[in-house]
Amino acid sequence: GTINVHDVETQFNQYKTEAASRYNLTISDVSVSDVPFPFSAQSGAGVPG
């Protein structure tokens, strides 16, 4: 099935809170959109994200 980025982020934030309270761990952040520049991108219509 497809993976919803928002759901993944919500889950991650829940785990982050749990890790902080239960294990005294600090997770700063994870970027789901840190991608290299798409030099191979082709022209084409679409809706900007």
């Epitope: 789901v32 959109s33 290299p36 030099f39 991108a41």
Partner: antibody, heavy 122, light 106 residues
């Protein structure tokens, strides 16, 4: 509403250094690549640097490589450009731009700030 | 690096006239972006990925092209279209801009 505001421009002597800042609001900063583009007194546009949303991927043209450093602080919604060994040809209006690209698309620099002026002269 | 040549450098058009601005690349590129800049303002993304109008751009504008030859067309020139238009390629590094076409209204 997306806002992009640059600061830090100044008159500096050749060989000197300067750090530009760009504060943004109105969108999730960490999800977007950001760039610096300069416009020379002759109105030519020149790309200066690009950094990915998380700061992992950084690109420069040869003209500034080794002299300029782009960085970002996602907690502060701020983009930076550290410039050193400045030359007279670096004189320009420096614009901060949002980059709307992803893994397999490039929708361009879709928001630009008004710019901050850098003059390199003795 | 890929050099983008825009022609003409300056042109004028009458209201209602069709206008075509061209952008020629020294090597083949996958797509280009177009920016509009009015005096005293920052450039604005106008057409992205060759043919897609940016938000708020009137439908009288269109973009086309492939390889080394690209164009921006205004079907019917209006006074507010008077500005300088720049093309940009990001198919290969360094990203480069054309030197611009200044479009004036007659």
């Amino acid at each position: 509403e997306v806002k992009v505001v640059e600061s830090g421009g100044d008159l500096v002597k050749p060989g000197g250094s300067l750090k530009l800042s760009c504060v943004v609001s109105g969108f999730t900063f960490s999800r977007y690549g950001m760039s610096w583009v300069r416009q020379t007194p002759g109105k030519r546009l020149e790309w200066v640097a690009t950094i990915s949303g998380g700061g992992t991927y950084i690109y420069y043209p040869d003209s500034v490589k080794g002299r300029f450093t782009i960085s970002r602080d996602n907690a502060k919604n701020t983009l930076y450009l550290q410039m050193s060994s400045l030359k007279s040809e670096d004189t320009a209006m420096y614009h901060c731009t949002r980059d709307n690209y992803g893994r397999n698309y490039d929708y361009g620099m879709d928001y630009w700030g008004q710019g901050t002026s850098v003059t390199v002269s003795s | 690096q890929i050099v983008l040549t825009q022609s003409p450098a300056i042109m004028s058009a009458s209201p209602g006239e069709e206008v075509t601005l061209t952008c020629s690349a020294t090597s083949s590129v996958s797509y280009i972006h177009w920016f509009q800049q009015r005096p005293g303002t920052s450039p604005k993304l106008w057409i992205y990925s060759t043919s897609n109008l940016a938000s708020g751009v009137p439908v009288r504008f269109s973009g086309s092209g492939y390889g080394t030859s690209y164009s921006l067309t205004i079907s019917r020139m209006e006074a507010e279209d008077a500005a300088t238009y720049y093309c940009q390629q990001r198919s290969s590094s360094p990203f480069t801009f054309g030197s611009g076409t200044k479009l004036e209204i007659k």
